[in-house]
Interface confidence: medium
C-alpha cells in the first residue's frame, strides 16, 4: 500500500483556486526526491503537469505552483483560475510517475450557480443556523409574511406569519418580525440539512404590491481535514462545534459503508469495543469544544471520522459536524512492542515502552487507563522519581535499555492489575503507546520468603530461589526506591532445593545485610535480566526492629520471621494468618479484610489466606516506612 496520502475528492467552482496537500513519510530520501502532480489519461499513464524540479506544463503556466515542506513531510499544489476542463483524475506522488508511490485525487470543477439579480447568497455549514433577512415596505407591515422554497418550477411554502410550518422544517424554524421601527422580518433555520440548500423567496403581502427578496442557501458539508499518522502511534481529534451546542451530547464516529457512521465514543458513555483501552474523550469546555485521543493506531483505524453534537450521542440529520480523513502510515517510525503482556498472580511483568529516541531527555510516564468518565489515565510513575503512593515497593520505571525504549516493572500482581496502561513522555505526543496486562493462572517462578524482620545491628540473609529456566539469566538483588531499584551485592549459594524436577541449574541467590540499620528497612527485589532487558521479579519487605537476642538471621522459606500467630506447614512454607502486621496506613476496621485496595487503585495492603507458596512469591504484606 502506498504511504502517500492526500484528499480523495476536491470540489471547487469555476474561477476559484484550490490548494491540495499531499503527505509522505518524512525519511531523508523522501524529503529530497522529486514531487509531482500529474493527470491520469484514459488509457493509463499519468502526464506531469507540475513537479518540484521546476517543470510546469503549458496548461498550468502562470496559475499553479508546487511547494515542498520537507520538515512536515508534505507538499502543496496550488491551482488558480479553475475551469471545468480541469475536472478529472490526478495523482500526487514521489519519484517517477509510474512507480506507484502516489495517491489518487479526483478534482471536480462545477459551474457557479446562475443566480437571479438581487439574490442574497447565504453559505452555512451543515448542522448550523442561518438567518434569512427579508425587508419590506410600510404598506406591507400588517400583511402576511412568508418564505417559499423553489422546488423545481414551483415555490413551496416553508413558513408564514399565520403559523404555518412546512413539515420538513418542524421544530427547527421560526419567523421573527422585528420591532415596529425596522421594516424587516427574518426566518431562522436551525440544524441545517443538505436538503435545505436551494433558492428561497421571501414575501411580504400577497398582491401585486408585495415585497419580494430572493435568497440562495448553500449548505456546506465539511471538507475533511487530512490527518496522517504512523501505525502504532496516536492521533488527537480536536472538535470545536461552538457554544450553541455546549450542553448537547458529543460524539466521534467513523463512517462505514454509505452514510452510516459508527459511534467510536460519546459523552453518554458509549465506546466501541475496538477502542477499549486506547481512547480518551477529554472533558468538553463551555464553548462546546472537546478532543479525542486514540493511541495504538491500527491499519483498520484509517478512514473518515466525524465529530458532532446531538442529544442521542450519534450522527443525525442536522447535527453540526467536523470531519477528518485519517491515513495510517504502515511505514511507521514507531517500533513494534508487545500490545499484550501476561503475568502470573503474585509474580511480575516487565513492560517495554518505546519513545522517540531524539527525545532521550524527555520525562517518561506510565498511567493506568480508566474507562469511566469517558476515559482518563491517572499517572502511576514517572522518570523523575515519583511513584503513586499505592504502588510503592512494587512499581519502577527504568530508563533502560535506553535508545528509544524504557522499562516499567510491576510486581506483586493481583487480578486487579489487569487492564490497559499507557506509555507516555512529555515530548512527542504521537508516541503514546498502549499495553494490556493480563493476569493468568500459574505460579511465580521466583521464590522468596514473605515479609522479613531484621534486627538492628545484626546480619540478615534473605534467599531468592531461581528455577532452571533462568540458568542463562543474570540474577540480582536490589533495594527499591522512588527512582528505581539500586543493585546490591548478592551471593550464589548453589542449586536450590525449592523446585521439584529441577536439576543443578536452579539457583539460590542470597542478599546479605550486615549490621542492619533503620535505613535498611524497605522493599527488596530479586530478579532476572539479560543485559538491559528485565525479566521476572519478586519483592520482599524487610522490617527492622530492636535487638531482642544476639545472633544473626538466616531467613529461609520455612519459618521466615515466624511469629506466635504463624504456623509452619509440613511443606516447609509458612502460612501467615490474618493477624499478621498490617500496613500501618490502613484503618483498624480494614485490617482483617482480605485483598483490600487502597482507594481501589492498586495497593496490595491485604493479607491473603491463599497457599503458602503463593505467599512466598507475592509478598503482599506491606510494611511501609515513611
Amino acid at each position: 500500500k502506498s504511504p502517500i496520502f492526500g484528499p480523495e475528492e476536491v470540489n471547487s467552482v469555476e474561477g476559484n483556486s484550490v490548494s491540495i496537500t499531499c503527505y509522505y513519510p518524512p525519511t531523508s530520501v523522501n524529503r529530497h526526491t522529486r514531487k509531482y502532480w500529474c493527470r491520469q489519461g484514459a488509457r493509463g499513464g499519468c502526464i506531469t503537469l507540475i513537479s518540484s524540479e521546476g517543470y510546469v506544463s503549458s496548461k498550468y503556466a502562470g496559475r499553479a505552483n508546487l511547494t515542498n515542506f520537507p520538515e512536515n513531510g508534505t507538499f502543496v499544489v496550488n491551482i488558480a483560475q479553475l475551469s471545468q476542463d480541469d475536472s478529472g483524475r490526478y495523482k500526487c506522488g514521489l519519484g517517477i510517475n509510474s512507480r506507484g508511490l502516489s495517491f489518487d485525487v479526483s478534482l471536480e470543477v462545477s459551474q457557479g450557480p446562475g443566480l437571479l439579480n438581487d439574490t442574497k447568497v447565504y453559505t452555512v455549514d451543515l448542522g448550523r443556523t442561518v438567518t434569512i433577512n427579508c425587508p419590506f415596505k410600510t404598506e406591507n407591515a400588517q400583511k402576511r409574511k412568508s418564505l417559499y422554497k423553489q422546488i423545481g418550477l414551483y415555490p413551496v411554502l416553508v413558513i408564514d406569519s399565520s403559523g404555518y410550518v412546512n413539515p420538513n422544517y418542524t421544530g427547527r424554524i421560526r419567523l421573527d418580525i422585528q420591532g415596529t421601527g425596522q421594516l424587516l422580518f427574518s426566518v431562522v433555520i436551525n440544524q441545517l440539512r443538505l436538503s435545505d440548500a436551494g433558492q428561497y423567496l421571501c414575501q411580504a403581502g400577497d398582491d401585486s404590491n408585495s415585497n419580494k427578496k430572493n435568497a440562495d442557501l448553500q449548505v456546506l458539508k465539511p471538507e475533511p481535514e487530512l490527518v496522517y499518522e504512523d501505525l502504532r502511534g496516536s492521533v488527537t481529534f480536536h472538535c470545536a462545534l461552538g457554544p450553541e451546542v455546549a450542553n448537547v451530547a458529543k460524539f466521534l464516529c467513523r463512517q462505514s459503508s454509505g452514510e452510516n457512521c459508527d459511534v467510536v465514543v460519546n459523552t453518554l458513555g458509549k465506546r466501541a469495543p475496538a477502542f477499549e483501552g486506547r481512547i480518551l474523550l477529554n472533558p468538553q469546555d463551555k464553548d462546546g469544544s472537546f478532543s479525542v485521543v486514540i493511541t495504538g493506531l491500527r491499519k483498520e483505524d484509517a478512514g473518515r471520522y466525524l465529530c458532532g453534537a446531538h442529544s442521542d450521542g450519534q450522527l443525525q440529520e442536522g447535527s453540526p459536524i467536523q470531519a477528518w480523513q485519517l491515513f495510517v502510515n504502515e511505514e511507521s517510525t514507531i517500533p513494534r512492542s508487545p500490545t499484550v503482556v501476561k503475568g502470573v498472580a503474585g509474580s511480575s511483568v516487565a513492560v517495554l515502552c518505546p519513545y522517540n529516541r531524539k527525545e532521550s531527555k524527555s520525562i517518561k510516564y506510565w498511567c493506568l487507563w480508566e474507562g469511566a468518565q469517558n476515559g482518563r489515565c491517572p499517572l502511576l510513575v514517572d522518570s523523575e522519581g515519583w511513584v503513586k503512593a499505592q504502588y510503592e515497593g512494587r512499581l519502577s520505571l527504568l530508563e533502560e535499555p535506553g535508545n528509544g525504549t524504557f522499562t516499567v516493572i510491576l510486581n506483586q500482581l493481583t487480578s486487579r492489575d489487569a487492564g490497559f496502561y499507557w506509555c507516555l513522555t512529555n515530548g512527542d505526543t504521537l508516541w503514546r503507546t498502549t499495553v494490556e496486562i493480563k493476569i493468568i493462572e500459574g505460579e511465580p517462578n521466583l521464590k522468596v520468603p514473605g515479609n522479613v524482620t531484621a534486627v538492628l545491628g545484626e546480619t540478615l540473609k534473605v534467599p531468592c530461589h531461581f528455577p532452571c529456566k533462568f540458568s542463562s539469566y543474570e540474577k540480582y538483588w536490589c533495594k527499591w526506591n522512588n527512582t528505581g531499584c539500586q543493585a546490591l551485592p548478592s551471593q550464589d549459594e548453589g542449586p536450590s532445593k525449592a523446585f521439584v524436577n529441577c536439576d543443578e541449574n536452579s539457583r539460590l541467590v542470597s542478599l546479605t545485610l550486615n549490621l542492619v540499620t533503620r535505613a535498611d528497612e524497605g522493599w527488596y527485589w530479586c530478579g532476572v535480566k539479560q543485559g538491559h532487558f528485565y525479566g521476572e521479579t519478586a519483592a520482599v519487605y524487610v522490617a527492622v526492629e530492636e535487638r531482642k537476642a544476639a545472633g544473626s538471621r538466616d531467613v529461609s522459606l520455612a519459618k521466615a520471621d515466624a511469629a506466635p500467630d504463624e504456623k509452619v506447614l509440613d511443606s516447609g512454607f509458612r502460612e501467615i494468618e490474618n493477624k499478621a502486621i498490617q500496613d500501618p496506613r490502613l484503618f483498624a476496621e480494614e485490617k482483617a479484610v482480605a485483598d483490600t485496595r487502597d482507594q481501589a487503585d492498586g495497593s496490595r495492603a491485604s493479607v491473603d489466606s491463599g497457599s503458602s507458596e503463593e505467599q512466598g512469591g507475592s509478598s503482599r504484606h506491606h510494611h511501609h516506612h515513611h
Partner: nanobody, 124 residues
C-alpha cells in the same frame, strides 16, 4: 505529591495588569496539567485557565479570553498567569492547581494538588 505556592496577587486599578506565579516543589511541575481557578466571596470556585504539561495546549474561561494568558517555564518549575485589562469582577482569591491525570485536558475534579491562593483585588 507536588506542593504549589501562588504569588503575585495584590490591589490594582481597573484596566491594570498583574502577573501571578505558581511555583512547584516536591516534584517537577511538567508532570502536571496545571490550572488557575478563582473564588470570589460567596461564590463557587470557577475555572480560569489551564495549560498542559508541554505548554502546547491552553484553554481559558470565556470571561477571561483575550485578557489572560497562561504559560509555563518548566526549567523554573513555575506556571504563570498574565492578567491584563483587569475588571472589578476579576476580584477573587486565585488558586493554582495541578493534576496527575493524563487526558490532555482535565476538569476541576481531576486537580488533586491545590495551592493556598493569592488575593487579587481590582478597584474601580
Amino acid at each position: 505529591e507536588v506542593q504549589l505556592v501562588e504569588s503575585g496577587g495584590g490591589l490594582v486599578q481597573a484596566g491594570g495588569s498583574l502577573r501571578l506565579s505558581c511555583a512547584a516543589s516536591g516534584r517537577t511541575i511538567n508532570t502536571y496539567v496545571t490550572g488557575w481557578f478563582r473564588q470570589a466571596p460567596g461564590k463557587e470556585r470557577e475555572f480560569v485557565a489551564r495549560i498542559d504539561w508541554s505548554g502546547s495546549s491552553t484553554d481559558y474561561a470565556d470571561s477571561v479570553k483575550g485578557r489572560f494568558t497562561i504559560s509555563r517555564d518548566n526549567a523554573k518549575n513555575t506556571v504563570y498567569l498574565q492578567m491584563n485589562s483587569l475588571k472589578p469582577e476579576d476580584t477573587a482569591v486565585y488558586y493554582c492547581a495541578g493534576s496527575a491525570y493524563y487526558s490532555g485536558y482535565v476538569t476541576h475534579r481531576d486537580f488533586g494538588s491545590w495551592g493556598q491562593g493569592t488575593q487579587v483585588t481590582v478597584s474601580s
